[in-house]
């Protein structure tokens, strides 16, 4: 099978307000060549959450824990979660194109829900 697999192992993640949320994503290959980005939501109105190559994302850090030979880790952590961060997050692989990169494959998405901060 030619297409790489984009694996978002968790369908949902629940985090208390003020904490950090880790969103997991693994891929089976770097090929086809092209960037990996994270979005909240789907379709034309989706919001870019992280692109390592360009942009400023002060609340996002990369989290690489997988050392398996057959997987590449593209997980992220978002700090200081607020209720406004709730939504479904997608890990998306793009294929390098000219002039623009082309969306190649998306993960199934991880729904982030935000619990009230413990009093």
């Amino acid at each position: 099978e030619d297409e790489l697999q984009v694996i978002q192992p968790e369908k949902s993640v629940s985090v208390a307000a003020g904490e950090s949320a880790t969103l997991r994503c693994a891929m089976t290959s770097l090929i086809p060549v092209g960037p990996i980005m994270w979005f909240r939501g789907a379709g034309a109105g989706r919001e870019l959450i992280y692109n390592q190559k360009e942009g400023h994302f002060p609340r996002v850090t990369t989290v690489s824990e997988l050392t398996k030979r057959n997987n590449l880790d593209f997980s992220i952590s978002i700090s200081n979660i607020t209720p406004a961060d709730a939504g479904t997050y997608y890990c998306v692989k793009f294929r390098k194109g000219s002039p623009d990169d082309v969306e190649f494959k998306s993960g199934a998405g991880t729904e982030l829900s935000v619990r009230a901060k413990p009093s």
């Epitope: 099978e1 030619d2 297409e3 790489l4 089976t28 290959s29 770097l30 090929i31 086809p32 060549v33 092209g34 960037p35 990996i36 390592q52 990369t62 989290v63 690489s64 050392t67 030979r69 057959n70 997987n71 590449l72 880790d73 593209f74 997980s75 992220i76 294929r95």
Partner: antibody
């Protein structure tokens, strides 16, 4: 046991063509990205070409782009490098190599020697 | 292109001692916290053999006297303790998502 066996090397005149083959066994060939890497005493190791597991996507450095064409036949567990318009600087040992994740080169063949000379 | 500079070009180390090889990239080879830098060993008349993948992961079957470290642009391969069968040339290789992929010029390790 993983085996990659290259063939098709030889002596060719500048401007000529050669077709290298790589026969794979001992692993699921159709799941692997495959590449060719060449080695010269002067330039060391140089990546030459890469093809995706299903053969849809191919990549080349500028030094061979437009002259070399990489293809594969997953039914035959075989990789092919068609080399046209050969130049003296293409003289090298050519290695077939596998890449499970399209990243590091996991396994290498023993190599086949290409000599371009008049 | 990302240029990989290996140092030293050659290294003579006593048996049982530590051998350290450096590889410096002209720009970062990190992607999402993973360093796409790899190390290979090549003995005369043989193809390269993968030792370390993604900066610090030991390939299956490779002795644990080999180790790799580093991130972004600076990487190190360490052999400790050096054994007679480790005499070879060692290469670093980057496979970041920006083509072309490139190799270092090699470091020849000999016994002092």
């Amino acid at each position: 046991e993983v085996q990659l066996v290259e063939s098709g090397g030889g002596l060719v005149k500048p401007g000529g063509s050669l077709r290298l083959s790589c026969a794979a066994s001992g692993f699921t060939f159709s799941s692997y990205v495959m590449s060719w890497v060449r080695q010269t005493p002067g330039k060391g190791l140089e990546w030459v070409a890469t093809i995706s597991s299903g053969g849809t996507y191919t990549y080349y450095p500028d030094s061979v782009k437009g002259r070399f064409t990489l293809s594969r036949d997953n039914a035959k567990n075989s990789l092919y490098l068609q080399m046209n318009s050969l130049r003296a600087e293409d003289t090298a040992v050519y290695y077939c190599a596998s890449q499970l994740t399209g990243s590091e080169f996991d396994y290498w063949g023993q190599g086949t020697t290409v000599t371009v000379s008049s | 292109d990302i240029v990989l500079t290996q140092s030293p070009a050659s290294l003579a180390v006593s048996l049982g001692e530590r051998a350290t090889i450096s590889c410096r990239a002209s720009e970062s080879v990190d992607l999402y916290g993973t360093s796409f830098m790899h190390w290979y060993q090549q003995k005369p008349g043989q193809p390269p053999k993968l030792l370390i993948y993604r900066a610090s992961n030991l390939e299956s079957g490779v002795p644990d006297r080999f180790s790799g470290s580093g991130s972004r642009t600076d990487f190190t391969l360490t052999i400790n303790p050096l054994q007679a069968e480790d005499v070879a040339t060692y290469y670093c290789h980057q496979s970041s998502d920006e083509l072309p992929w490139t190799f270092g010029g090699g470091t020849k390790v000999e016994i002092k």
